[in-house]
């Protein structure tokens, strides 16, 4: 079963996707696609990493985060409910039978009418039931999949502000991270 | 346009190990997105997949056959080859190489193929 | 694994016929379905990819539709050349697996 993250239209929506390289800059290829994963890479790939580079976009759909550290999750600008449905995210790493594939469900809500609230500055207060803890294998995930109410493109925004707090670190942890070597 | 071209014995004897190659000539084995695989057919039968390398260094090999089976890849010689072990009878079949090349806009056309080898297995 | 059955094993029409070759998955395989044909003493021909879409210089007579579970390949109007054996094949979940084949023959 698909973990389900949720935006409203209009917004950025947020799919994370982590994983460690073996050393620094010694990334494995990674890709995106709208659709469950396959056999082979993505279908209908919307991004695509070498072990270089982001060699392969379509707009709209952009890595937010520093991938040359693992962090391979997803942006979907300005979103709309076409853009609901299953995401791949694929970890093309080297060896026997050794590829991660995560299938992230995306859920768009119509977009609310209502006046936005002040943002809470407060991680804590914002987000209570934030996971923080660290996986220890690498077929164990954590998401935020448990975690169905928080508006992710909140958690997205805030996570950009504090990107080198520890708070930023929390938040990556509670993602899908894979680490390799 | 890539062409694969087959080699390797066409008799095996029980117990021993099979050994094909398949020289890629047209591209370059190690190019992106491509993923090399070997497929059989028993004689009279449906395909079977035995498993890929992709450009990626990433493996896979059917269950069915996983303990027995190594595909590898020579970037010198442009090739890459197929090893399956403690051959029976059983393993007799045309075994095909193919390659995929995965392409952002079309997928997956598996439009490449080798001429296929009859390997037998009898003493 | 997921096992692809194919229907009618055998199918006998006459050139200019409009045949239709079914096959089902034991689960759902999205659109990531595959046809082939293969003659004798060749190797497969990549007909149709991701269940509707025709490979390179593959004529219009072939199409494909479905998705899920239960996929149907369709020649409109059959030409000599495609009296022959076709499989579909599932990329979905490793293994890869093909179905059994239907046999396309001469009436």
């Known amino acids: 079963s698909e973990v389900e993250y949720r935006a409203e239209v209009g917004q950025n929506a947020y799919l994370p996707c982590f994983y460690t390289p073996a050393a620094p800059g010694n990334l494995v290829p990674v890709c995106w696609g709208k659709g469950a994963c396959p056999v082979f890479e993505c279908g209908n790939v919307v991004l695509r990493t070498d072990e270089r580079d982001v060699n392969y976009w379509t707009s709209r759909y952009w890595l937010n985060g520093d991938f040359r550290k693992g962090d391979v999750s997803l942006t979907i600008e300005n979103v709309t409910l076409a853009d609901s449905g299953i995401y791949c995210c694929r970890i093309q790493i080297p060896g026997i039978m050794n590829d991660e594939k995560f299938n992230l469900k995306l859920v768009i809500k119509p977009a609310k009418v209502t006046p936005a609230p002040t943002r809470q500055r407060d991680f804590t207060a914002a987000f209570p039931r934030m996971l923080t803890t660290r996986g220890h294998g690498p077929a164990e995930t954590q998401t935020l999949g448990s975690l169905p109410d928080i508006n992710l493109t909140q958690i997205s925004t805030l996570a950009n502000e504090l990107r080198d707090s520890r708070l930023a670190n929390d938040l990556r942890d509670s993602g899908a991270t894979i680490r390799i070597g | 346009q890539v062409q694969l071209q087959q080699s390797g014995p066409g008799l095996v004897k029980p117990s021993q190990t099979l050994s094909l190659t398949c020289t890629v000539s047209g591209g370059s084995i190690s190019s992106g997105g491509y993923y090399w695989s070997w497929i059989r057919q028993h004689p009279g039968k449906g395909l079977e997949w035995i498993g890929y390398i992709s450009y990626s260094g990433s493996i896979y090999y059917n269950p069915s056959l996983k303990s027995r089976v190594t595909i590898s890849v020579d970037t010198s010689k442009n090739q890459f080859s197929l090893k399956l072990s403690s051959v029976t009878a059983t393993d007799t079949a045309v075994y095909y190489c193919?390659?995929?090349?995965?392409?952002?806009?079309?997928?997956?056309?598996?439009?490449?193929w080798g001429q296929g080898t009859l390997v037998t297995v009898s003493s | 694994e997921i096992v692809m059955t194919q229907s009618p094993a055998t199918l006998s029409l006459s050139p200019g016929e409009r045949a239709t070759l079914s096959c089902r998955a034991s689960q759902s395989v999205s659109s990531y379905l595959a046809w082939y044909q293969q003659k004798p003493g060749q190797a497969p021909r990549l007909l149709i990819y991701d269940a509707s879409n025709r490979a390179t210089g593959i004529p219009a007579r072939f199409s494909g539709s479905g998705s899920g579970t239960d996929f149907t390949l369709t020649i409109s109007s059959l030409e000599p050349e495609d009296f022959a054996v076709y499989y579909c094949?599932?990329?979905?979940?490793?293994?890869?697996?093909f179905g059994q084949g239907t046999r396309l023959e001469i009436k």
């Open positions: 094949q599932q990329r979905s979940n490793w293994p890869i697996t």
């Open positions: 193919a390659t995929a090349y995965y392409d952002l806009l079309t997928g997956y056309p598996f439009d490449y």
